[in-house]
Interface confidence: low
Amino acid sequence: VCSRDFTPPTVKILQSSCDGGGHFPPTIQLLCLVSGYTPGTINITWLEDGQVMDVDLSTASTTQEGELASTQSELTLSQKHWLSDRTYTCQVTYQGHTFEDSTKKCADSNPRGVSAYLSRPSPFDLFIRKSPTITCLVVDLAPSKGTVNLTWSRASGKPVNHSTRKEEKQRNGTLTVTSTLPVGTRDWIEGETYQCRVTHPHLPRALMRSTTKTSGPRAAPEVYAFATPEWPGSRDKRTLACLIQNFMPEDISVQWLHNEVQLPDARHSTTQPRKTKGSGFFVFSRLEVTRAEWEQKDEFICRAVHEAASPSQTVQRAVSVNPELDVCVEEAEGEAPW
């Protein structure tokens, strides 16, 4: 029996890419490239966790370039199988020898783009309730090995208060962790810097986030409140709008009051601060009121809480559903208009 020299194949598995959003599509293709071997019979077998898979190998195609041949075989997997941590192997038998390459879903190294955010206290908590808190938010964690740790510190080295932690599973099966730290009103106003340090076994290094009082120019908000006119078909409901503009910095709290009572935040919808054409910021706030409310007392107050507002960090404007009644009242209380 004469033995002849042959060039053994190189076996490499390639994997189809994720979709545009970085998620796995419903099916994943694995491509086994068997390249650079002396032409001859080869057998390709796919294994799942070491077990031979019953797959159609008719898709395997062979090409020859010069003296060497290449073959490729494709395996289509469901997303479920790919995500289930199984190992897939392309096993090639050639000239009595076995060559193989294996692959599996990579561990989420970050995990999967974990992000951390640190908020400043709301002006309402800071100036009205006088119990400010800051929140460290960690999103997009896998519910996997090792707990995420959030630790607080102060740039001054002074001790921090006791924080409260909350963990929430999102619809997409990721984990969101928040840690809320009470801070001293005076410490915050005097410019203390607070740091949140996030550690997790899957993170290549700790994430650090810090927050402090915003520096830069200050400007008090201007507040304007309006009532929309009656609309056909909605006589028992009205929308009140409040424009708050030209304030700096952007931290602001908006409240609506009726009968001297603050309405729940869920009652109104307020935009995030947006930059004006100048150097300040503006927000819009929208409140729906019912006939029962305005017939009880037709005065609603839009209040902005902002550090530059004086004397008590608040600016407010009253608005009525039927402003013509206000005109009569004002005229009746003042001098006769003639």
């Epitope: 995500l83 941590d85 896998a142 519910p143 996997s144 090995k145 707990t147 599973k169 997409n172 099966g173």
Partner: antibody, heavy 119, light 111 residues
């Protein structure tokens, strides 16, 4: 391969408690949420709640908040659900099911554990 | 809670028939571009088995005669040509909002 193997059937007296186990194998136990679902005789499926085995964090269907307690033991790759103050209405098959990471469906289920409450 | 109403509750069909089961949600189960609706098959004495996830994706190993469609509040599970092994109870499930809920089930029986 992924397997969820539950403890055997139980017969319990009203007022007592029972602890059902679900042993996971073939995957990284603490990389996935473990849920529990119940099915009363001849009835449909009801979601009870879940646990994150890593942190022990649990969420419950309000209906079962005072009935079920879900725990997990990472060292043995086992999830547990304890049912307290048993009543005849708690007679059902209880399933554990694994939720896929970043997805909201149950691809793998335990075989089910029948809990019968009878005096 | 989101209520899921399946119809019909039961149906009799023959091998080779095309079978359609609908599931209506009391509110939308779409969120941020994804649809949180799944379908399961359950045979007596067995655990449920995933058939369709995210409204229209066929789970691996599930025959292509099964298909799912829909978005928002209205969903359909279709079996294009009923086979003897398909006689079972089918459940829809929403996972858009806690508590996750299931439909009451549709029993497919032999005519």
């Amino acid at each position: 391969q992924v397997q969820l193997v539950q403890s055997g059937a139980e017969v319990k007296k009203p007022g007592s408690s029972v602890k059902v186990s679900c042993k996971a194998s073939g995957y990284t136990f603490n990389g996935y949420w473990m849920h529990w679902v119940r099915q009363a005789p001849g009835q449909g499926l009801e979601w009870i709640g879940y646990i994150n085995p890593t942190t022990g964090h649990t969420e419950y269907n309000q209906k079962f908040k005072d009935k079920a307690t879900i725990t997990a033991d990472e060292s043995t790759n086992t999830a547990y659900m304890e049912l307290s103050s048993l009543r005849s209405e708690d007679t059902a098959v209880y399933y554990c099911a694994r939720q896929e990471y970043r997805h909201s469906w149950f691809a793998y289920w335990g075989q089910g554990t029948l809990v019968t409450v009878s005096s | 809670d989101i209520q899921l109403t399946q119809s019909p509750s039961s149906l009799s069909a023959s091998v080779g028939d095309r079978v359609t089961i609908t599931c209506r949600a009391s509110q939308s189960v779409d969120y941020d571009g994804d649809t949180y609706m799944n379908w399961y098959q359950q045979k007596p004495g067995k655990a449920p088995k995933l058939l369709i996830y995210a409204a229209s994706n066929l789970d691996s190993g599930v025959p292509s005669r099964f298909s799912g469609s829909g978005s928002g509040t209205d969903f359909t599970l279709t079996i294009s040509s009923l086979q003897p092994e398909d006689f079972a109870t089918y459940y829809c499930q929403q996972t858009n909002e806690d508590p996750w809920t299931f439909g009451q089930g549709t029993k497919v029986e032999i005519k």
